[in-house]
Amino acid sequence: CKAMHVAQPAVVLASSRGIASFVCEYASPGKATEVRVTVLRQADSQVTEVCAATYMMGNELTFLDDSICTGTSSGNQVNLTIQGLRAMDTGLYICKVELMYPPPYYLGIGNGTQIYVIDPEPCPDSDF
């Protein structure tokens, strides 16, 4: 397993609809043809996989399991969008990138993006 640098923004604020987007960029040491990207949420000491996708270079991302994420890839960048976030989902979202093929296998883990989610205030009753 060889190490690889992964960059991601330090802070992102989710929209009022609970949507947060960020870019995960990796320094590919070679010409990878198959990549797996995983987003991990770290809150307190617990780490949970939020979403994961595999893709062949130039193709669309195929997300695994009951994913709340969407995304696109462009070169060594993956644009990720997480939906359905609530205030309780505020936390550190870490991007993990694996270059699966061809060998050798490379693994890179970003420092994380702190995503802040603020639940929208309910609209006050209107007399109109």
Epitope: V47, E49, T54, G84, Y101
Partner: antibody, heavy 119, light 107 residues
Framework: QVQLVQSGAEVKMSGASVRVSCKAS????????ISWMRQAPGQGLEWMGW????????NYAQKLQGRVTMTTDTSTGTAYMELRSLTSDDTAVYYC????????????WGQGTLVTVSS | DIQMTQSPSSLSASVGDRVTITCRAS??????LNWYQQKPGKAPNLLIY???SLQSGVPSRFSGSGSGTDFTLTISSLQPEDFATYYC?????????FGGGTKVEIK
């Protein structure tokens, strides 16, 4: 604690449809999706697909595309799997399952629902 | 789709034996490999996830190893309650796929 309780056994005629329910409890239903697996008598496990409870997005196994529909009712915390145009090959125990902290890993399973298709 | 091949398909062993089951993926899946135990008439029970992590509540006589394409489930000292069928499953990519199963029977 997390519990998944499935509907009872069904006997169906060939060509008919079946709907299996999976009632979830012990967690916030929309925080996790539900996956469905099946197991023919004496055979191995087959992944059928999953549904994201939060937004209703679904992803089905290619061989079942067009015949299977997975839905959720967030008001009752229940997931449903409907399979149409049944044949004897669809005779199986159908399971719903939920992931834990890791994607595609299933610590939580329903008890199973036997669907028998007779011709 | 990723094919998962388990071997052997069945084995006979005695209480106290060390049992090893192997699982091979048709392509590299890193450590995204899980093991389940299933008893007749019951749902599968998760034993090992991500190749080597022991699921909470599972006895320590169960262990998993491997990465890439080749994986192993080991039962260090077989107990009467361990006679069951064991399945591997990859969680690397969709569609999720299972091995054909290994039935562990009493010798």
């Amino acid at each position: 604690q997390v519990q998944l309780v499935q509907s009872g056994a069904e006997v169906k005629m060939s060509g008919a449809s079946v709907r299996v329910s999976c009632k979830a409890s012990g967690y916030t239903f929309t925080s996790y999706g539900i996956s469905w697996m099946r197991q023919a008598p004496g055979q191995g496990l087959e992944w059928m697909g999953w549904i994201t409870a939060y937004n209703g997005n679904s992803n089905y196994a290619q061989k079942l595309q067009g015949r299977v529909t997975m839905t959720t009712d967030t008001s009752t915390g229940t997931a449903y799997m409907e399979l149409r145009s049944l044949t004897s090959d669809d005779t199986a125990v159908y399971y719903c399952a939920r992931r834990g902290d890791y994607l595609g890993v299933f610590p939580y399973w329903g008890q199973g629902t036997l669907v028998t298709v007779s011709s | 789709d990723i094919q998962m091949t388990q071997s052997p398909s069945s084995l006979s062993a005695s209480v106290g034996d060390r049992v090893t089951i192997t699982c091979r993926a048709s392509q590299s899946i890193s450590s995204y490999l899980n093991w389940y135990q299933q008893k007749p008439g019951k749902a599968p029970n998760l034993l090992i996830y991500t190749a080597s992590s022991l699921q909470s509540g599972v006895p320590s006589r169960f262990s998993g190893s491997g990465s890439g394409t080749d994986f192993t489930l080991t039962i260090s000292s077989l107990q009467p309650e361990d006679f069951a069928t064991y399945y591997c499953q990859q969680s690397y990519s969709s569609p999720l796929t299972f091995g054909g199963g290994t039935k562990v029977e009493i010798k």
